[in-house]
């Protein structure tokens, strides 16, 4: 899928007030040091690229990711603010059915997650060089 | 002007299904979550499930695992919720209601008029 | 499974006067994720305050609502007689989507 045309604006603000609070939630107890960025995005639709990526495609050792409640927001989001986003997933989701069943949440889970917040940042600040 | 219109009441023995439908219209059906939510006689709200008709993916609560089906019809705009070995204490009042963006915080904004189903032998 | 507790489950208060009904969280959430509604009978429910404090559209000014961590409230400032209805706080942190039991405003 093609983000281009999406309203970040609005996925943004859905960001800041809901989906955010939600990824701190799912990472409380955790150090915000403990994990090291290795995922970068260079605007924001590329930024939405890696974060669709990251939050619904199975990886190993995190198999749960997408029946978390900040993914089903950030689903959300997308499926509002980014024009057919929602005719593009049938076959994706579809044939990760069995192997997503909310579970308890490991380390490499948590790592991911922190590369999603990272991820969300860089998507709000658009304007900055890559590093 | 968004609406979701439900099925019918429908009058069941204990052991068999129903299946209660959500026409949704004024939007596009495919890009937003739908919710089922049951509502007893004088008692309190609770929550089945969602199901997200973009790619079928759902959500139940674990009391309706195993027993509850929600399933989307993109074609004709319309969520089913299907509910299976019946008893008396499914006797209620079953609600679909539209997940979505509110002011930026994500909540149910519209709701269908409910449909009762009574569970007596 | 997060369980929310509404105080008072019933209510029979006068016009104008002031009403609070609070809402107790097991564990506490984000105040984004904490939802009001308001039911009359033979009624859907219909949204009231979400985020914890942002009224929904059509909801008069004489109602708001507060909060953060486990603690809820929603405050009437001067009751009217339409006000009177079933009102029921939700969390939408985790799974399942609980409600509390419900608060039922009578006027007298």
């Known amino acids: 899928y093609d983000f281009t045309n999406c309203d970040f604006e609005k996925i943004k603000a859905a960001y800041l007030s809901t989906i955010s609070k939600d990824l701190i939630t799912y990472m409380s107890g955790t150090k915000s040091t403990e994990f090291n960025n290795t995922v970068s995005c260079s605007n924001r639709p590329h930024c939405l690229t890696e974060i669709q990526s990251l939050t619904f495609n199975p990886t190993a050792g995190c198999a749960s990711l997408a029946k978390e409640m900040f993914a089903m927001k950030t689903k959300a989001a997308l499926a509002i603010w980014c024009p057919g986003y929602s005719e593009t997933q049938i076959n994706a989701t579809q044939a990760m059915k069995k192997r997503r069943k909310r579970k308890v949440t490991t380390n490499k889970c948590l790592e991911q997650v922190s590369q999603l917040q990272g991820l969300w940042r860089r998507f709000n600040r658009p304007l900055l060089k890559q590093q | 002007q968004v609406q979701l219109v439900q099925s019918g009441a429908e009058v069941k023995k204990p052991g068999s299904s129903v299946k209660v439908s959500c026409k949704a219209s004024?939007?596009?059906?495919?890009?937003?979550?739908v919710n089922w939510v049951r509502q007893a006689p004088g008692q309190g709200l609770e929550w089945i499930g969602q199901i997200y008709p973009g790619d079928g993916d759902t959500d139940y609560a674990q009391k309706f695992q195993g027993r509850a089906t929600l399933t989307a019809d993109k074609s004709t705009s319309t969520a089913y919720m299907e509910l299976s070995s019946l008893r008396s204490e499914d006797t209620a009042v079953y609600f679909c209601a539209r997940g979505t963006y509110y002011n930026n915080y994500y909540g149910t904004d519209y709701w269908g008029q409910g449909t009762t189903v009574t569970v007596s032998s | 499974e997060i369980v929310l507790t509404q105080s008072p489950d019933f209510q029979s208060v006068t016009p104008k006067e002031k009403v609070t009904i609070t809402c107790s969280v097991s564990?506490?959430?984000?105040?984004?994720?904490l939802h009001w509604y308001q039911q009359k009978p033979d009624q859907s429910p219909k949204p009231w305050i979400y985020g914890t404090s942002n009224l929904a559209s059509g909801v008069p000014s004489r109602f708001s609502g507060s909060g953060s961590g486990t603690d809820y409230t929603l405050t009437i400032n001067s009751l009217e007689a339409e006000d009177a209805a079933t009102y029921y706080c939700q969390q939408w942190s985790s799974y399942p989507l609980t409600f509390g039991q419900g608060t039922k405003l009578e006027i007298k």
């Open positions: 004024g939007y596009t059906f495919s890009s937003y979550w």
């Open positions: 564990s506490s959430i984000s105040s984004s994720n």
